[in-house]
Amino acid sequence: EAHKSEIAHRYNDLGEQHFKGLVLIAFSQYLQKCSYDEHAKLVQEVTDFAKTCVADESAANCDKSLHTLFGDKLCAIPNLRENYGELADCCTKQEPERNECFLQHKDDNPSLPPFERPEAEAMCTSFKENPTTFMGHYLHEVARRHPYFYAPELLYYAEQYNEILTQCCAEADKESCLTPKLDGVKEKALVSSVRQRMKCSSMQKFGERAFKAWAVARLSQTFPNADFAEITKLATDLTKVNKECCHGDLLECADDRAELAKYMCENQATISSKLQTCCDKPLLKKAHCLSEVEHDTMPADLPAIAADFVEDQEVCKNYAEAKDVFLGTFLYEYSRRHPDYSVSLLLRLAKKYEATLEKCCAEANPPACYGTVLAEFQPLVEEPKNLVKTNCDLYEKLGEYGFQNAILVRYTQKAPQVSTPTLVEAARNLGRVGTKCCTLPEDQRLPCVEDYLSAILNRVCLLHEKTPVSEHVTKCCSGSLVERRPCFSALTVDETYVPKEFKAETFTFHSDICTLPEKEKQIKKQTALAELVKHKPKATAEQLKTVMDDFAQFLDTCCKAADKDTCFSTEGPNLVTRCKDALA
């Protein structure tokens, strides 16, 4: 229904705390370089204005759209052109073009320093002094680094953060209470970020139909007892929510997400038997819980998929009458039977089924033509299954760091033109799939592995799009989202690449490496490994292992030495010589 004042409506629906949080996220995601204080000032102004509209919906400007109100605020920021360059040109446009212009200027890789966590005592002091400001800083810092972060979910993570601090700051040993808990939240939030970015990429490049197909498959796996009409309704609503968040309509997105959670909890009987524990929680926890609820038990009496989609004499007639509905039904039926498949795989199978019907229904004897379609799915299913087995075996053998290194070598060989920091980031993220997925029960591994890899590769594509350097990467990133992972997996050594010349300074290290945290040490070593592969793309695994073992030994020796600087300056050149010889 239409409201006289959109801003008053959203303020009333969301309440002041969530309203302010979402407006802060919106501003931080649009203007990623502004300080917290600048954004906090704007948020307060917008909130004060919203309150005047709540008091009187007919007050001046209360009838304006949210994008007009927010955009006018952003465009009034001083020195916009000096700080943001051509983004300032957006302010010459009118709504809704101005908003979409802002959206297109979001930077997936902003040049901001890593978000450093203060030490426990300092953190607890500032949290106790002003919890609201502390959480505001958290929202701002995460949102500006992750401009597509799912806003209502970021509120959930802020709430988690708040609860952890409340609990741990009362403990004697704050550090050992905070560190593992906050590390856990950080890891989950980073995964949430890449997953949501993939959803927005899907909407941006392939539109609503592609996203809705993803939603149908995912929801059908989770709620196999819900009928097709119910799944379609949920998929439509979920598509709307995600579209709003990806489009920067964060207040509408959060409001509609709350509505969807409410609907699901009021209709558990027709959706799933597993929702009750989620539905007992408060709003943010409820919505989060529903988004990752365990799969319902599959109905015991499901007929074979072939009955309606291969053996039925009316297949081509049903397909011709309503293609989208027929294919949607196929995707629903196949997905509810296969919670053990990844969504990407299910969408590839649906695509294969569609291509088969397109071809066969134009022939003289369609049933003879499409009769073998399910058998033709086999290679499509085997490929990711083999991928999971091979990679989980390797992970179990090497551990996370070794597995990351194996992936780093593989991907540097596939796309040696890509910048070393991007390759290292990608390999570290791809390598985490082992820890995340390989320890799961067999039937959960494939969906975990492939859908996570797809999200990470989406980020690789986004970063590469900014500065395209590799034809291999361009080829894989240009196709459909569901074909990306198989495309990257199939890439081999790039034969067109001219190896980088050996530069001694790339492999020269100093004693400061000894005091770095373990993660930073790993990144330094992985940077060297990528550079080695760029120098010798066809180096064998054995050669690379020899060099890296030597390198690790060198670091260990020099970091334990009484005179570290002398050790690094004398032993370093020897290491470089040995590396060159080993790779010759």
């Epitope: 490049k205 609503e208 139909r209 989208d324």
Partner: nanobody
């Protein structure tokens, strides 16, 4: 393949009305978003209005909100733009466009794969 043919343009006085039509032939289906853009001489092509074929949701540029109305007739596969209270600054060539995927950014011309040839609207006394 989709073909789009606009009609209904012409000369009208300020304050007057016009109704543009866009006949779509070929395989338009429920996932389509249809839109109207315009281009005045020496200016960039700008977004005017759009509608989702599936749910009928509409979008307007601020400059035409309250004066223009977009609508569709599914049975005739036709898109309309009712333009009231026309102003001199509405003078432009009006184009009908179709995005078969309903991509996220509906004001971006590059997201529309199919275009009509355009119809000229002149608002002058």
């Amino acid at each position: 393949e989709v073909q789009l043919v606009e009609s209904g343009g012409g000369l009208v006085q300020p304050g007057g009305s016009l109704r543009l039509s866009c006949a779509a032939s070929g395989s338009t289906d429920s996932a389509y978003r249809m839109g109207w853009f315009r281009q005045a001489p020496g200016k960039e092509r700008e977004f005017v209005s759009a509608i989702n074929w599936s749910d009928g949701r509409t979008y307007y540029a601020d400059s035409v909100k309250g004066r223009f109305t977009i609508s569709r007739d599914n049975s005739k596969n036709t898109l309309y733009l009712q333009m009231n209270s026309l102003r001199a600054e509405d003078t432009a060539v009006y184009y009908c466009a179709a995005d078969p995927d309903s991509r996220l950014y509906y004001t971006v011309p590059q997201n529309y794969d199919y275009w009509g040839q355009g119809t000229l609207v002149t608002v002058s006394s």
